[in-house]
């Protein structure tokens, strides 16, 4: 079987990090010459000579973790026999995605006119790694022209409740922007906008006519 | 009841800066994003920007961008905004207003640039 | 940027007339992001209506609002002598808020 190498970094790393390095002897003693196979992400290099595996781009955790790549360590004269190793390059995770909506929300609505305030909920999410707790996320309104119509408060780590303020909307669409914290280190925010549709509707859902062009909708902020 | 109340008129030179402050009370100051609007003499209204008070989150107007620094200090319910490389142009009257609700506006703080 | 564009620039008027003051909008908004102020000299501007129709606390009836789309309009049913002042309407549906450029009402 495979010798398997295993080494962990951050997947911050600068580029031109050593992530690792590859050993292999030769029972004649003849030097060994180092090479690389199947780096398809084009995420590293190594040391022809010595064995040492640097990274030569940005690594990405998200993009799967461990990374792996076969290493192939050839005689350098003589038979030139060779024999291949496996590399594995387990990433860390760092707090680099901003949060995002769990979901397409293009469905949104509210049945015009509104008897009362009415409220919708939410879901969001990101790319990171959640060790030992879930995803604690914050809402907020994304911009103070929103306050005097939309509040938006937090139910859980991942969820928020968007409300409206009153029941004057007319038969048309809002965007709500959205600000969601996800509290990490670094703190990283996403900026979301959430359509939120006052249609007249029809056992509980919108009644759009039969060839009704509803045409540009206006962004309400 | 809500009240802001500016910091006094300001003469400054071309190229100094000067910082207005906006002294909020009646109310929870993190509550309610706390906006910024310019007069220049004889003209409309405009927006300069926007600040959440409660994490400092700022939107501005791109025209003030470069121009105009909003900044809160929470312990003291006071909304600050500052502008830069004066010239005559930003001679202004500015107010600070609370737009959640539409209402409260601060009495309004003249700076003038002058050499 | 979402354009105010208001009219007449003046309005000559005697007390007991009716005022109508116009704001067109560039683009469609939402009747609850449109609403208009009162400017008197050397004073901050004073919300008269919001969303449109709605007048603020301690504003008189004689105000009223109307409109929808990109056409509002302010009516003052009957002037009074402390009515004669600068009124702007202003924008909420997009960033930047925008203001119109002013109607100056003054006395015939």
């Known amino acids: 079987s495979q010798h398997v190498f295993q080494a962990k970094v951050s997947e911050d790393v600068a580029i031109g990090t050593k992530v690792g390095n590859v050993t292999a002897k030769d029972p004649e003693g003849l030097d060994i010459s180092y090479s690389l196979r199947g780096d398809t992400r084009g995420w590293l290099k190594i040391d022809h000579v010595t064995g040492e595996i640097f990274s030569v781009a940005p690594l990405d955790r998200e993009a799967g973790s461990p990374y792996r790549v076969q290493v192939v360590a050839t005689e350098v004269g003589g038979s030139s026999l060779s024999s291949v190793s496996e590399f594995h390059l387990i990433l860390m995770d760092v707090n680099d995605n901003p949060p995002r909506l769990a979901k397409d929300y293009t469905g949104l609505f509210f049945c015009h006119p509104l008897s009362a305030p009415g409220s919708l909920i939410f879901e969001a999410t990101d790319d990171d790694q959640h060790l030992f707790r879930g995803p604690h996320f914050t809402f907020s309104l994304g911009s103070g022209s929103l306050q005097n119509d939309w509040e938006v408060s937090k139910i859980n780590g991942t969820h928020a409740r968007l409300s409206t303020r009153h029941t004057e909307f007319e038969e048309r669409e809002y965007v709500v922007l959205i600000r969601i914290n996800d509290g990490g280190r670094p703190p990283l925010e996403g900026i979301v906008s959430l359509p939120v549709t006052f249609c007249s509707c029809v056992e509980g859902s919108c009644f759009r006519p039969a060839g009704h062009q509803t045409g540009i909708p206006t962004v309400g902020m | 009841q809500v009240q802001l109340v500016q910091s006094g008129a300001e003469v400054k030179k071309p190229g100094a800066s000067v910082k207005v402050s906006c002294k909020a009370s009646?109310?929870?100051?993190?509550?309610?994003?706390m906006h910024w609007v310019k007069q220049a003499p004889g003209q409309r209204l405009e927006w300069i920007g926007e600040?959440?008070?409660?994490?400092?989150?700022?939107n501005y107007n791109q025209k003030f961008k470069g121009k105009a620094t909003l900044t809160v200090d929470k312990s003291a319910s006071t909304a600050y905004m500052e502008l830069s490389s004066l010239r005559s142009e930003d001679t202004a009257v500015y107010y600070c207003?609370?737009?959640?609700?539409?209402?409260?506006w601060g009495q309004g703080t003249t700076v003038t640039v002058s050499s | 940027e979402i354009v105010l564009t208001q009219s007449p620039g003046t309005l000559s008027l005697s007390p007991g007339e009716r005022a109508t003051l116009s704001c067109s909008v560039s683009?469609?908004?939402?009747?609850?992001?449109l609403h208009w102020y009162q400017q008197k000299p050397g004073q901050a501007p004073r919300l008269l209506i919001y969303?449109?129709?709605n007048r603020a606390s301690g504003i008189p009836d004689r105000f009223s609002g109307s409109g929808s789309g990109t056409d509002f309009t302010l009516t003052i049913s009957r002037l009074e002598p402390e009515d004669f002042a600068v009124y702007y309407c202003?924008?909420?549906?997009?960033?930047?808020?925008?203001f119109g450029q002013g109607t100056r009402l003054e006395i015939k």
């Open positions: 207003a609370l737009y959640y609700g539409y209402g409260d």
């Open positions: 969303r449109t129709r």
């Open positions: 009646g109310y929870t100051f993190t509550t309610y994003w």
């Open positions: 202003q924008q909420g549906s997009n960033l930047p808020l925008t």
């Open positions: 683009a469609s908004i939402s009747r609850i992001h």
């Open positions: 600040i959440d008070p409660s994490d400092s989150y700022a």
